[in-house]
Interface confidence: low
C-alpha cells in the first residue's frame, strides 16, 4: 500500500481542502472511525488500485486516524493496512468528543490504560488532573491518543489553554472491576412454605462486581414473570445478591429454582439449584418408633428422644400424668427442642438422677395452628434388687425354715442353693440349687407383692428343709434386669449346741 | 396472634446501663431465634444481637460485642438485652424480633415489636 501524503502526521488548516490518495494491487479503501467515507475509487491500466479520499472544509472535528486498507475479505497483514494521523487545529473545537462508552474505563487487573482526551492542535499542552484537583498529574501525553498510566480508581478531567482561554475535557471514570470465577450459592428464607406463604429466595455470588442473574423457576414456565431484585451486600465487598419474591406462593410453586449467573468480563458462568415446597397446610409428623413402655435405672439420667418433621415451626410441651413439665429450677429436669434441619425437630425430655417418683405416664405434645401429634408412653424406674432379710428359725414341727425377703423393679427372680462342705464350699465345690427337686427334702413357698407407693416388687421366699443332720451354707439370690444381690446363713441342725 | 412486647428503654449517662426485656405471647409462638435490633431516624435498622431459643448460639454485632449481651427466660417466653458501658452513638429505637434464623437480616424475622427508645446523654 502507498499513501500519498506518506505521513505519518499531518497537520492542516482549518477550512481548507485536502486530497489523501492509497494505491495498491487489490482494491483499497479508505476508513475514518470504522467507517468508509465518500471517496473515488480507480483501477489504472496497469491494474494497480487507487482510492482518492477528498477533504473539503476542515475542522478541528476532522482530526483523527486515517487507515488505507484492502478492501476484499482476505485476511490482512499488517503492512497491508496504513495509519494516518491529521491535526486540524481549530481554536473552536477543545477537546475532541467522546463516545459515552470512552468515558468509563473498566479494569479487571493492575494494568496500562489511555485516558483519550485529545485536543486538535499538536502544539498544544494538555495535563491530566484528578476531577477535583488542581495538581498536573505526572503522565505522558500523546496528542495522538491521550494521557496513558497506571491509574487509581477516580474520576480524572484534562486542561488545556488556548488562547486566553482554559478548556476542561469530560470527567473520565476509572473503574477497578473484581472479576474472579464465579461461585453461585442459592439459598431460601424456607425450602418448605404454606400456600399464601411468601417464596423468597438469594442467589448470591462473590468475588464480582460485573455479573448477570438469571432466574428460571416454576412460574416463569407459564409465563408469569417475577421481577428480581439485585443488590450489593456493603458489610461484605464483591457480594452480590439477587433475590427472588414470590408473594402468595400457589401449590403449583412447588418445584426448582434455578439461579445462573454470567461474569460478562470472562466469560464465566456457574448456577445453583433449591427444591421448594409448597403445601395446602401445614403439618406434624413422627418419625422413627418410640416404644410404648420406656425404662429408666434408679438414680442414673435418662434421657428421652422424640423426632419429628414440622412446618410451620411447632411448639412443643411434655406433660407427666396430664401436668404440663417445664425446666426444673432443681436441674432434675432439662427439656430442649433442636431445630436439626429446616423442618426436622428432636425434642428431648432428660431426667437427671432418676428418682421412683419419676416413673408414669409421659406425653409430648408439638403443634402448631394447622397440624398436631402427640407421643405418649410408660415411664418404669427400674430399682436394682437388694436382698433386706435372710433369717433361720425352726418352728416345733421339727423340720427348719429359711426366710429370704427382697425388693426390687422389674420382679425379681429368686434362686436358693445350698452347700453342704463347709470347708470347700463354695470356692471348690459348685453349690447345689434348692426347691427345684424332691431330693433335697426341701419345699419352697414364694410370694411377691407390689408396692404402689415406691413401685417396686417385693419377694417372700421361705423355704423348709425337712432335716438337717449336719451345718449347711444356705444362699439366698435375687435377680433383676439391672442386677443381683445375695445372702447366705448357716443352718445347723438341731442337736448341735451352736449356731453361726 | 404473636406479640412481642419491648420494656426497659430510657435515658441513661454514657457509661450507665439499661437491660431491654421482650415479652412474647400468642398461641402458636415458637420461633426458635429471638434478636434485638435498632433505629435512628433516617437510617436502616440495623442488627444488634440474636440468641437461639437454647440459647447455645448468639451473635452480636461488631460495634456492640464486648458491651451487650442477649439472654432468655424460657419460662417467660421472654428475651432480655443487657446493654452495660453505654455510648451516646448507642442512642436509638430498639426493636425486638423473633424469627427462626441467626441471622443479621432483617428479612429473616417473622414477627417484631413496636419498639422502646434508648436514650443515652453525653
Known amino acids: 500500500l502507498v499513501v500519498t501524503p506518506p505521513g505519518p502526521e499531518l497537520v492542516l488548516n482549518v477550512s481548507s481542502t485536502f486530497v489523501l490518495t492509497c494505491s495498491g494491487s487489490a482494491p483499497v479503501v479508505w476508513e475514518r472511525m470504522s467507517q468508509e467515507p465518500p471517496q473515488e475509487m480507480a483501477k489504472a491500466q496497469d491494474g494497480t488500485f487507487s482510492s482518492v479520499l477528498t477533504l473539503t472544509n476542515l475542522t478541528g472535528l476532522d482530526t483523527g486516524e486515517y487507515f488505507c486498507t484492502h478492501n476484499d475479505s482476505r485476511g490482512l497483514e499488517t503492512d497491508e493496512r496504513k495509519r494516518l494521523y491529521i491535526f486540524v487545529p481549530d481554536p473552536t473545537v477543545g477537546f475532541l468528543p467522546n463516545d459515552a462508552e470512552e468515558l468509563f474505563i473498566f479494569l479487571t487487573e493492575i494494568t496500562e490504560i489511555t485516558i483519550p482526551c485529545r485536543v486538535t492542535d499538536p502544539q498544544l499542552v494538555v495535563t491530566l488532573h484528578e476531577k477535583k484537583g488542581d495538581v498536573a498529574l505526572p503522565v505522558p501525553y500523546d496528542h495522538q491518543r491521550g494521557f496513558s498510566g497506571i491509574f487509581e480508581d477516580r474520576s480524572y478531567i484534562c486542561k488545556t489553554t488556548i488562547g486566553d482561554r482554559e478548556v476542561d475535557s469530560d470527567a473520565y471514570y476509572v473503574y477497578r472491576l473484581q472479576v474472579s470465577s464465579i461461585n453461585v450459592s442459592v439459598n431460601a428464607v424456607q425450602t418448605v412454605v404454606r400456600q399464601g406463604e411468601n417464596i423468597t429466595l438469594m442467589c448470591i455470588v462473590i468475588g464480582n462486581e460485573v455479573v448477570n442473574f438469571e432466574w428460571t423457576y416454576p412460574r416463569k414456565e407459564s409465563g408469569r414473570l417475577v421481577e428480581p431484585v439485585t443488590d450489593f451486600l456493603l458489610d461484605m465487598p464483591y457480594h452480590i445478591r439477587s433475590i427472588l419474591h414470590i408473594p402468595s406462593a400457589e401449590l403449583e410453586d412447588s418445584g426448582t429454582y434455578t439461579c445462573n449467573v454470567t461474569e460478562s468480563v470472562n466469560d464465566h458462568q456457574d448456577e445453583k439449584a433449591i427444591n421448594i415446597t409448597v403445601v395446602e397446610s401445614g403439618y406434624v409428623r413422627l418419625l422413627g418408633e418410640v416404644g410404648t413402655l420406656q425404662f429408666a435405672e434408679l438414680h442414673r439420667s435418662r434421657t428421652l428422644q422424640v423426632v419429628f418433621e414440622a412446618y410451620p415451626p411447632p411448639t412443643v410441651l411434655w406433660f407427666k400424668d396430664n401436668r404440663t413439665l417445664g425446666d426444673s429450677s432443681a436441674g432434675e429436669i432439662a427439656l430442649s427442642t433442636r431445630n436439626v434441619s429446616e423442618t426436622r425437630y428432636v425434642s428431648e425430655l432428660t431426667l437427671v438422677r432418676v428418682k421412683v417418683a419419676e416413673a408414669g405416664h409421659y406425653t409430648m405434645r408439638a403443634f402448631h395452628e394447622d397440624a398436631e401429634v402427640q407421643l405418649s408412653f410408660q415411664l418404669q424406674i427400674n430399682v436394682p434388687v437388694r436382698v433386706l432379710e435372710l433369717s433361720e428359725s425352726h418352728p416345733d414341727s421339727g423340720e427348719q425354715t429359711v426366710r429370704c425377703r427382697g425388693r426390687g423393679m422389674p420382679q425379681p427372680n429368686i434362686i436358693w442353693s445350698a452347700c453342704r462342705d463347709l470347708k470347700r464350699c463354695p470356692r471348690e465345690l459348685p453349690p447345689t440349687l434348692l426347691g427345684n427337686s424332691s431330693e433335697e427334702e426341701s419345699q419352697l413357698e414364694t410370694n411377691v407383692t407390689y408396692w404402689e407407693e415406691e413401685q417396686e416388687f417385693e419377694v417372700v421366699s421361705t423355704l423348709r428343709l425337712q432335716h438337717v443332720d449336719r451345718p449347711l451354707s444356705v444362699r439366698c439370690t435375687l435377680r433383676n434386669a439391672v442386677g443381683q444381690d445375695t445372702q447366705e446363713v448357716i443352718v445347723v441342725p438341731h442337736s448341735l449346741p451352736f449356731k453361726v | 396472634e404473636v406479640q412481642l412486647v419491648e420494656s426497659g428503654g430510657g435515658l441513661v449517662q454514657a457509661g450507665g446501663s439499661l437491660r431491654l426485656s421482650c415479652a412474647a405471647s400468642?398461641?402458636?409462638?415458637?420461633?426458635?431465634?429471638m434478636g434485638w435490633f435498632r433505629q435512628t431516624p433516617g437510617k436502616e435498622r440495623e442488627f444488634v444481637a440474636a440468641?437461639?431459643?437454647?440459647?447455645?448460639?448468639?451473635h452480636y454485632a461488631d460495634s456492640v460485642k464486648g458491651r451487650f449481651t442477649i439472654s432468655r427466660d424460657h419460662a417467660e417466653n421472654a428475651v432480655f438485652l443487657q446493654m452495660n458501658s453505654l455510648k451516646p452513638e448507642d442512642t436509638a429505637v430498639y426493636y425486638c424480633?423473633?424469627?427462626?434464623?441467626?441471622?443479621?437480616?432483617?428479612?429473616?424475622?417473622?414477627?417484631w415489636g413496636q419498639g422502646t427508645q434508648v436514650t443515652v446523654s453525653s
Open positions: 400468642g398461641r402458636s409462638f415458637s420461633s426458635s431465634v
Open positions: 424480633a423473633a424469627g427462626n434464623y441467626l441471622d443479621t437480616a432483617q428479612y429473616r424475622y417473622n414477627y
Open positions: 440468641t437461639r431459643w437454647t440459647a447455645a448460639s448468639t
